[in-house]
């Protein structure tokens, strides 16, 4: 969800910190659009429901995305 009607991109700051997939409530990958010209990855944490902006270029975050997509492919029939 954008921060407001006037601000284009949500992630003012981004994090390189590794995220434990088990601590994730939700992972949103927002593709680049006419509003925000870059991909944004927003992780909603189970604890406190805090939303974190993740660095799409970070090795740790790329590994997280791989782990999550692997988990999703296991679950899908």
């Amino acid at each position: 969800v954008p921060l407001s009607r006037t601000v284009r991109c949500t992630c003012i700051s981004i994090s390189n910190q590794p995220v434990n997939p088990r601590s994730l409530e939700k992972l949103e990958i927002i593709p680049a659009s006419q509003f925000c010209p870059r991909v944004e990855i927003i992780a909603t944490m189970k604890k406190k429901g805090e939303k974190r902006c993740l660095n799409p270029e970070s090795k740790a975050i790329k590994n997280l995305l791989k782990a999550v997509s692997k988990e999703m492919s296991k679950r899908s029939p």
């Epitope: 921060l3 407001s4 009607r5 006037t6 601000v7 284009r8 991109c9 949500t10 992630c11 003012i12 700051s13 981004i14 994090s15 390189n16 010209p37 870059r38 927003i42 805090e50 939303k51 974190r52 902006c53 660095n55």
Partner: antibody, heavy 120, light 108 residues
């Protein structure tokens, strides 16, 4: 430790220009968006400007729009505020502040401030 | 522009007492509200973001609550170092980001 240090404050005449700097250390500057916030003597806090972590997006308070420009040099770990056409009402302590590393807008690390006085 | 009104302007209390500070928004800001503490001659310090999340290193005696237009910062038991000015700040529908006028918590 994580630190922000502002510099460049001075006494200037109305209509003149000034550039403030904010040197960051102890954290990965290139992943943080940054703000300028000011405080007139004896008054409350006023947000001035923001710049995204990669410098792509910038927004300003109406009171400084078209006069002030925020920029960020990630290779030098430094934030800047170019202030043109200064007015008496710009007199304040100017703080640089780091945006928190969550999908929110809040200032989790502040500099000590630098005083700008606009007076003839 | 969203206007934040803080009350009371001055709160006179003794150490050990409970402090309740109010911040009211001119329109709904959802949970997009932060609280800061500022001592004389110092920069502000982030206490609470997103209405109720304590910032790193902030003691548990500080808590935030509320959503929409009415918010509260509670200090459960005032310590001597808690006497300061407190500001609320919103980020709904920004720019601009706006701050309240502040509440000064002073020693009775």
């Amino acid at each position: 430790q994580e630190q922000l240090v502002e510099s460049g404050g001075n006494v200037v005449q109305p209509g003149r220009s000034l550039r403030l700097s904010c040197a960051a250390s102890g954290f990965t500057f290139s992943t943080y968006g940054m703000h300028w916030v000011r405080q007139a003597p004896g008054k409350g806090l006023e947000w001035v400007a923001v710049i995204w972590y990669d410098g792509s997006d910038k927004y300003y308070a109406d009171s400084v729009k078209d006069r002030f420009t925020v920029s960020k040099d990630n290779s030098k770990n430094t934030l800047y505020l170019q202030m043109n056409s200064l007015r008496a009402e710009d007199t304040a302590v100017y703080y640089c502040a780091r945006n928190i590393a969550v999908a929110d807008v809040a200032f989790d690390l502040w500099g000590q401030g630098t005083m700008v006085t606009v007076s003839s | 522009e969203i206007v934040l009104t803080q009350s009371p302007a001055i709160l006179s209390l003794s150490p050990g007492e409970r402090a309740t500070l109010s911040c009211r928004a001119s329109q709904s800001v959802s949970s997009y509200l932060a609280w800061y503490q500022q001592k004389p001659g110092q920069a502000p310090r982030l206490l609470i973001y997103d209405a109720s999340n304590r910032a790193t290193g902030i003691p548990a005696r500080f808590s935030g609550s509320g959503s929409g237009t009415d918010f509260t910062l509670t200090i459960s038991s005032l310590e001597p170092e808690d006497f300061a000015v407190y500001y609320c700040q919103q980020r709904s529908n920004w720019p601009p980001l706006t701050f309240g006028g502040g509440t000064k918590v002073e020693i009775k």
